[in-house]
């Protein structure tokens, strides 16, 4: 899995989207979890409604909300009143039984100030053997959001 970087500004809201194949993941609940260490489990933050048909209903845990468009195949996580503590590595997951498939790895970065936005080149960071030419960077800048695909070193 590549990792997508989402940058938000402290005090504002940040929306993270995780697209997926709606047919492949039909009937499956979703979750948002945080990787606190290089090894070890992904710690569950919030999951969609216990009844899959009600997955469109927004569920909150503290300042984090999750909602699932099961037809369109987009899981959306909202981090309200973004704080430094929210920075970190997360995963969007699709749940089946006691197992979980990773839909997307997400790196959340919290900026102190909109002026701290960097150019796209700064969003890339190399794995062990990648060169800059190999990096594929997408980015879209709004007042409080910057998103880009970046390669990611192994977490195991």
């Amino acid at each position: 899995h590549n990792t997508t970087v989402f940058q938000g500004v402290a005090g504002q809201s940040l929306q993270v989207s995780c697209p997926y194949d709606s047919m492949k993941h039909w009937g499956r609940r979703k979750a948002w979890c945080r990787q606190l260490g290089e090894k070890g489990p992904c710690q569950r933050v919030v999951s969609t409604h216990n009844l899959w048909l009600l997955s469109f209903l927004r569920r909150w845990n503290g300042s984090t909300a999750i909602t699932d468009d099961t037809l369109g195949g987009t899981l959306t996580i909202t981090l309200r009143n973004l704080q430094p503590h929210d920075a970190g590595l997360y995963q969007c997951q699709s749940l089946h039984g006691s197992e979980a498939d990773t839909l997307r790895k997400v790196l959340v970065e919290v900026l102190a100030d909109p002026l701290d936005h960097r150019d796209a080149g700064d969003l890339w960071f190399p794995g062990e053997s990648e060169s800059f030419e190999d990096a594929h960077v997408e980015h879209s800048i709004s007042r409080s959001l910057l998103e880009g695909e970046i390669p990611f070193p192994p977490t195991s």
Epitope: L36, Q83, H85, D86, A87, G88, E109, V110, D116, F125
Partner: antibody
Framework: QVQLQQSGAELARPGASVKLSCKAS????????LSWVKQRTGQGLEWIGE????????YSNEKFKGKATLTADKSSSTAYMELRSLTSEDSAVYFC????????????????WGTGTTVTVSS | DVVMTQTPLSLPVSLGDQASISCSSS???????????LHWYLQKPGQSPKLLIY???NRFSGVPDRFSGTESGTDFTLKISRVEAEDLGVYFC?????????FGAGTKLELK
């Protein structure tokens, strides 16, 4: 093991600038935030700010904006703090400290502290 | 800024005693994510601080179980059940719930 080796003591004139370094080893430098903390002789600790070495993004204490600039060099796994327009108030020991959470803010907690650098400002 | 008030500033003890250090915050340290970011560090003479307890009561790896942390509202306590010689130094509490991160003035644990 995880270590943060800081540069040697600095003696500077009022109005001058100094650049302190903090070389990280024993972990993936870009995976953890690094903070800088000031300790004046016989006094408490003051948080200056933090840097995410992966992106270069910084998060600072308003009190130190204009005083301290944080940077990081990924190739050498070294973080830097430049202090400018030095006055006697800047005479202190400065520590770098590693955040304890993977790709997270050092706001969670500092799990490893550097050796410290003494800065003396005197004419 | 959140003010962290530590008491006492000096705590004379005998080896084997129980020691208790208090830290009070000027506002609640409960973050919107449910965590309470109150930590304890020990700085031995001539050394860098070291993490003892994070998030109120979690002992950092390698920290002996004679150290424990508790909370009651905005009041926090670090307890050392039986003081050993290696425990002597200055103890700092720190809050990192609010920006900027702040520290207490420190409590010096010393021999009577």
């Amino acid at each position: 093991q995880v270590q943060l080796q800081q540069s040697g003591a600095e003696l500077a004139r009022p109005g001058a600038s100094v650049k302190l370094s903090c070389k990280a080893s024993g972990y993936t430098f870009t995976s953890y935030a690094l903070s800088w903390v000031k300790q004046r002789t016989g006094q408490g600790l003051e948080w200056i700010g933090e840097i995410y070495p992966r992106s270069g993004n910084t998060y600072s204490n308003e009190k130190f904006k204009g005083k301290a600039t944080l940077t990081a060099d990924k190739s050498s796994s070294t973080a830097y703090m430049e202090l400018r327009s030095l006055t006697s108030e800047d005479s202190a020991v400065y520590f770098c400290a590693k955040g304890g959470v993977y790709y997270g803010s050092s706001y969670w907690y500092f799990d490893v502290w550097g050796t410290g650098t003494t800065v003396t400002v005197s004419s | 800024d959140v003010v962290m008030t530590q008491t006492p500033l000096s705590l004379p003890v005998s080896l084997g005693d129980q020691a208790s250090i208090s830290c009070s915050s000027s506002q609640s340290l409960v973050h919107s994510n449910g965590n309470t970011y109150l930590h304890w560090y020990l700085q031995k003479p001539g050394q860098s601080p070291k993490l003892l307890i994070y998030k109120v009561s979690n002992r950092f790896s390698g920290v002996p179980d004679r150290f424990s942390g508790t909370e009651s509202g905005t009041d926090f306590t670090l307890k050392i059940s039986r003081v050993e010689a290696e425990d002597l130094g200055v103890y700092f509490c720190s809050q990192s719930t609010h920006v900027p991160l702040t520290f207490g003035a420190g409590t010096k644990l010393e021999l009577k």
